[in-house]
């Protein structure tokens, strides 16, 4: 039975031209995390493999940086970066856990972080 939960940074906003850290945390399970995939809608942004390290998709290499931890840093944000982001935790033996983050990139200088929430 899958007992884990993923906590994410939830709904967040950031300034155009700035950067943002996408973070997820898997808790309440003893399952081994073998890989974390970061996706934007249907596009793979990056992979963090527990054994080998990070792979950043070539089309995002200039604007995506690994970490901190299993998180992902998006840089030089544009309004086109607004949308849903998913952290997909591949675990053994539980299977796959998915967390969702919604990022809004604002033209203005006021960008506030949303509340944290959990996805079972």
């Amino acid at each position: 039975m899958m007992t884990g939960t993923i906590e994410t940074t939830g709904n967040i906003s950031a300034e155009k031209g700035g950067s943002i850290i996408l973070q997820c945390h898997l808790s309440s399970t003893t399952a081994q995390v073998t890989q974390v995939n970061w996706e934007q809608q249907d596009q793979l942004l990056a992979i963090c493999n527990a054994d080998l390290g990070w792979h950043i998709s070539p089309s995002f290499k200039d604007r995506v940086a690994p970490g901190p931890g299993l998180g992902l840093t998006l840089q030089s944000l544009t309004v086109n970066d607004t949308g849903e982001y998913f952290c997909i935790y591949h675990t053994y033996p539980d299977g796959t856990y998915t967390g969702r983050i919604f990022l809004e990139v604002l033209e203005s200088s006021v960008a506030e972080h949303g509340a944290r929430f959990q996805i079972p």
Partner: antibody
């Protein structure tokens, strides 16, 4: 005691194929990712590829991508490396190595692959 | 790919000497750095993982330090069985890459 034992090396002509095996014992094979690492005669170490323990996804070095395929049979505690379209520059000792936390913590003794006409 | 550069490529030392080998990464790898020892005709053996953690069964005369792009392996008092080639390896960005090796020879 953790043990990895490679087999299947030998002399093959350019363009030929070879399948290497790596038999594992002394640990729960299905819990660990495993990599192949090679070493050309008198040269340094080069990572070849990796296979995940449970889902079976793989990664490869650019130098072998599309020519080499890694697979595993957890019921037999065995790892495989299928090598096709072999080139002279693939000549090396091939090691299987258990992956753990970013390092390769246990290695086999290696098997020599010679690609020559 | 991340380039790993070791120095020196070779060194001569005597039993009892303190030996330090350095490894530089072409970009930050945080602390995802491992060190291996290889003797002629044998498979490599893991000595240090995550820059400074000693692998099971490895003598405490081996130590590692560093983070970011600069790392060192130190053998506090060289023993006869330590004459070998040493490799660093990064595990921060796929593909994993190794340094070219440092051969430690008897003076």
């Amino acid at each position: 005691e953790v043990q990895l034992l490679e087999s299947g090396g030998g002399l093959v002509q350019p363009g030929g194929s070879l399948r290497l095996s790596c038999a594992a014992s002394g640990f729960t094979f299905s819990n660990y990712g495993v990599s192949w690492v090679r070493q050309a005669p008198g040269k340094g170490l080069e990572w070849v590829g990796y296979i995940n323990p449970s889902r079976g996804y793989t990664y490869y070095a650019d130098s072998v991508k599309g020519r080499f395929t890694i697979s595993r049979d957890n019921s037999k505690n065995t790892l495989y490396l299928q090598m096709n379209s072999l080139r002279a520059e693939d000549t090396a000792v091939y090691y299987c190595a258990r992956s753990y936390g970013g390092g390769f913590d246990y290695w086999g003794q290696g098997t020599l692959v010679t690609v020559s006409s | 790919d991340i380039q790993m550069t070791q120095s020196p490529s070779s060194l001569s030392a005597s039993v009892g000497d303190r030996v330090t080998i350095t490894c530089r990464a072409s970009q930050t790898i945080e602390r995802r750095l491992n060190w291996y020892q290889q003797k002629p005709g044998k498979a490599p053996k893991l000595l240090i993982y995550d820059a400074s953690s000693l692998h099971t069964g490895v003598s405490s005369r081996f130590s590692g330090s560093g983070s970011g792009t600069y790392f060192t392996l130190t053998i506090s008092s060289l023993q006869a069985e330590d004459f070998a080639t040493y490799y660093c390896q990064q595990s921060y960005i796929i593909p994993p890459t190794f340094g070219q090796g440092t051969k430690v020879e008897i003076k």
